[in-house]
């Protein structure tokens, strides 16, 4: 039988007359144009809702735009537009909310042709009021803000000047001409490029890396002939274009740009790009695009110095520079990433690693499902997930892979079962242990969101009929129970819920077509008496993650320990709550080989465990450049990977000497970076 | 019922061999790691060592590694023991236990204990 | 080696009182720590396993809490039949350990 309809699928009890009383209807009294909703805040229910209407004249196009707010998660929204003096926004711009819960909000207008400068509207109390502010440029992107203090902002305009504003957008300073890109790093720092003669364009290859500290009072120049430049976790990367050719390489800082390594990964050229596709504090993960238009590269993974890279997977879908890939962090388990790998007949499989990028292998087959077409052996064949790639091919396919730090082990995506992703219309399947096991939890292409931190799940099925029936789960996706919320079926264009998979409210967004007017409507569905208590010890039972044999005493090491978590009970029916904090245990584990990468001058063979010396360096001493000094290298083949927290064991030695000379192994050399100040 | 029963204790000069049995009845033994754990005379519970159900995975104390030897007969439900090069620290009460099928799992059924004395 | 430390080593109680005994690890050990009873001239049985979940047929009167390093086994009201040792197990980590017993006596 179906998912959901065994006889064991115990139902909630009376749940029709428990939604019905919390089902909030709002119909938007607007032309249904396009509309973008924000959520101001963490837990303060205050949501805000855009809707622009353009109409194209014969010369220009008029648009107008309304500005809604909510307080309640959605259930009931006020018409705001006049506190913004009926100003149509520019959709492109959307709606820059402050990080945190600063309740800080930019909305940049539209002006008129002829204006000196652009026009914002700033509110700092959760968007009740709004203050309009005359800009002394036009901003070319969104308002930025600083991650360490919401007061701090920086936009670019449309003529390359970097614009910094110390008081929420009080005032603006233009701190520098000619930026062509602009980031806030670490302690209000800003990274930015500058070209010298033509243009962004014009000097790609040739830009300058700048730094200020102090908001602009002061510059220090810290790369030169940039190609480009990215922030992840605590690494700063620059691609530098090499002195005799075409060519360019990844150099690396982990100090703010004062000093620079070149990372040991391939050169790119013109037609190539490299794109980091995960970082964190330990450790990044890099695409390196493979020449010709071949649409697959090579990942790579970083020591804790961003410097020695291991390969990690070969043929990785990247279809063009900021083209698509699959490339997916799994939030609800530590260390598992899901992508899609190009095979030699052009088809697409996907691809799991549970060990940040070590190893990776194909999907486990789901119990519940038969092999497709695709498949050569009808008993042998693997679940291939639907992400980026296949939505960017129009693929009937409505939403990327899903997964909530809160939730732990839940995944949710589209998926079919063969030997590669197949065209067919997908199924919608689960894994309740981070990607191990996997089950078919929906049939056909649905909408889906994880609400009460993985206490209930919600879905919608994708159709282009209009809708009015909603899917709930309160066991994981086991058993679902339908809901009908309108009587009058809508056109659905959205779910929404608070970000972060703790609220208990959803939104369906769609809208209803009459014969002569379209209207915006929203329905916001509050689960709480659904899950009618509160969640108590023993709802919770302990749970082993990447547990693959629970008779080996190694069972569930990655990365040198193992985490036990308490999860809600499939079987328990109540609230995890809105303050629930996931709780796991570590344990350390003892060192193996499998906790070590291999060293600078070492590769290992496939399907081996040892590094050996790669061939061309055998018998040289390893001598290497880091920070502009020659380094002297004793080894024997084995780094330890960046996080890895094992201890005893296996224990490699191994010993880096300085051996006090200078050199130059990279672009970026202390002696070319310079300092100045306004 | 759930049982195991241990056999194969005596006394044993230092030096010698023993070799320890345990017969399992009242569940399925091949699905199970067993262990053997051992109580010298007035004091506390030492583990020995354990071997998974298809004895892929065994394991010792550093007490008794190159002495002992664990191994298990599912079809016979029966879990052994060889005890060599005995040393008197090595007297005790020495118990069959089976591990639960949970990871990290807890030792949910025991023996009732035979009897090592090594002594000259 | 991870060192399991019990304390008291001994505890004389009068029935119905509750008993505490407390079991401290060397390291984390998570949840994977379990309690054993043993009365005289027996052989152990499982009390709680995972620190808190009490094995099938026990008196409803033990109970087990804690994680990580710092473990507590109760015996709520005391009974006559409950004098015996009592010992903690951790099946974290490699070697398996046992803490060194609580003797628990009827006053």
């Known amino acids: 039988s179906a998912p959901g309809e065994d006889e064991e699928c115990g139902r909630v009890r009376d749940f029709v007359a428990k939604l019905a009383n919390n089902t909030h209807q709002h119909v938007f009294d607007d032309l249904r144009g396009s509309v973008s909703l924000s959520w101001v805040g963490d837990s303060t229910g205050v949501i805000l809702v855009l809707t622009t209407f353009h109409v194209p004249l014969v010369i220009m196009t008029f648009g107008q735009s309304k500005l809604y707010r909510s307080e309640d998660y959605g259930k009931n929204f006020k018409d705001i537009t006049d506190l913004i003096n009926n100003t149509f926004i520019r959709t492109e711009f959307g709606m820059a909310i402050g990080p945190e819960n600063s309740g800080k909000v930019v909305l940049t207008a539209e002006v008129s042709g002829g204006s000196r400068g652009g026009r914002i509207f700033r509110s700092s109390d959760f968007a009740k009021n709004f203050v309009q502010t005359d800009l002394p440029f036009h901003p070319l992107t969104q308002m930025m803000y600083s991650p360490q203090n919401s007061d701090y902002l920086l936009a670019l305009s449309t003529e390359n000047g970097l614009w910094v504003s110390k008081n929420f957008g009080g005032k603006w300073e233009e701190i520098h001409k000619a930026v062509c890109l602009a980031k806030w790093g670490s302690d209000n720092t800003i990274f930015f490029t500058t070209y010298a003669n033509g243009s962004c364009k014009a000097d790609l290859g040739a830009l300058e890396l700048w730094r200020t500290s102090d908001l602009g009072k002061s510059f220090k120049t810290i790369g030169v002939k940039i190609y480009s430049f990215g922030l992840g976790g605590r690494f700063l990367f620059a691609s530098v274009m090499a002195d005799k050719d075409t060519t360019r390489r990844i150099h690396v800082s982990t100090d703010q740009g004062d000093t620079w390594s070149m990372a040991q990964l391939p050169s790119v050229g013109q037609e190539q790009f490299y794109s980091i596709l995960a970082a964190n504090d330990d450790m990044v993960f890099m695409h390196v695009d493979e020449p010709g238009d071949t649409g697959f590269g090579t990942i790579f993974t970083s020591d804790d110095r961003g410097i020695v890279y291991s390969k990690s997977l070969d043929r990785h879908l990247y279809t063009t520079t900021g083209g698509e890939t699959d490339f997916t962090n799994v939030t609800s388990l530590r260390g598992v990433y899901i992508t899609s790998v190009l095979s030699e007949d052009n088809s697409i499989q996907t691809m799991i690693t549970f060990d940040q990028g070590g190893r990776w292998t194909h999907l486990r087959k789901p119990e519940n499902s038969e092999c497709d077409a695709t498949a050569k052996n009808k008993n042998e064949c693997s679940l291939h997930i639907h992400a980026s790639y296949s939505i960017s091919q129009k693929l009937n396919v409505p939403m990327a892979p899903l997964s909530e730090p809160n939730a732990v082990g839940i995944v949710i995506a589209h998926g079919s079962v063969g030997d590669a992703i197949s065209v067919m219309v997908p199924d919608v399947y689960i894994s309740d242990d981070g990607g191990y096991s996997w089950t078919k939890m929906l049939e056909g292409p649905h909408y889906y969101t994880i609400l009460d931190s993985g206490g209930i799940i919600v879905a919608i099925e994708h159709s282009s009929r209009p809708i009015n029936v909603i899917k709930f789960s309160t066991d994981e996706g086991q058993c679902w129970q339908t809901y009908t919320f309108t009587r009058d079926p809508i056109y659905f264009t959205g779910l929404a819920s608070e970000p972060g998979a703790r609220s208990m409210n959803i939104s369906i967004w769609g809208f209803t077509e009459s014969f002569l007017t379209s209207q915006w409507v929203s329905y916001t569905i509050d689960f709480k008496d659904i899950l009618e208590r509160n969640c108590e010890e023993k709802d919770y039972t302990i749970w082993l993650a990447h547990s693959t044999d629970p008779e080996d005493y190694e069972d569930g090491c990655i990365l040198g320990y193992k985490e036990q978590f308490l999860r809600l009970r499939k079987s328990s029916v109540c609230q995890n709550g809105r303050d629930y904090v996931v709780t796991k245990q570590p344990s350390i584990c003892l060192c193996s080989l499998e906790d070590f990468l291999c060293d600078f001058g070492y590769y290992r063979p496939e399907n081996d465990s040892k590094c050996v010396e790669q061939p061309e360096l055998k018998g040289h001493d390893l001598e290497f450049c880091l920070y502009g000094r020659e380094e002297h290298l004793t080894t024997n083949g084995y780094r330890k990977i960046p996080g890895d927290k094992c201890q005893g064991g296996v224990n490699p030695v191994r010993e880096v000497k300085d051996l006090k000379k200078k050199c130059t192994s990279n672009f970026l050399s202390p002696e070319k970076q310079n300092s100045k100040s306004n | 019922e759930v049982q195991l029963v241990e056999s194969g204790g005596g006394l044993v000069k230092p030096g010698g061999s023993l070799r320890l049995s345990c017969a399992a009845s009242g569940f399925t033994f091949s699905s199970y790691s067993m262990n053997w754990v051992r109580q010298a005379p007035g004091k506390g519970l030492e583990w020995v060592s354990s071997i998974s159900s298809s004895s892929s995975y065994i394991y010792y104390a550093d007490s008794v590694k190159g002495r002992f030897t664990i191994s298990r007969d599912n079809a016979k439900n029966s879990l052994y023991l060889q005890m060599n090069s005995l040393r008197a620290e090595d007297t005790a009460v020495y118990y069959c236990a089976r591990r639960g099928s949970g990871s990290y799992d807890a030792f949910d059924i025991w023996g009732q204990g035979t009897m090592v004395t090594v002594s000259s | 080696e991870i060192v399991l430390t019990q304390s008291p080593d001994f505890q004389s109680v009068t029935p119905k009182e509750k008993v505490t005994i407390t079991c401290r690890a060397s390291q984390s050990i998570g949840y994977s720590l379990h309690w054993y009873q043993q009365k005289p001239d027996q052989s152990p049985k499982l009390l709680i396993k995972y620190a808190s979940q009490s094995f099938s047929g026990v008196p409803s009167r033990f109970s087990g809490s804690g994680s990580g390093t710092d473990f507590t086994l109760t015996i709520n009201s005391l009974e006559a039949e409950d004098a015996a040792a009592y010992y903690c197990?951790?099946?974290?980590?490699?070697?398996?350990?046992f803490g060194g017993g609580t003797k628990v006596e009827i006053k």
């Open positions: 197990h951790q099946s974290s980590s490699l070697p398996l350990t």
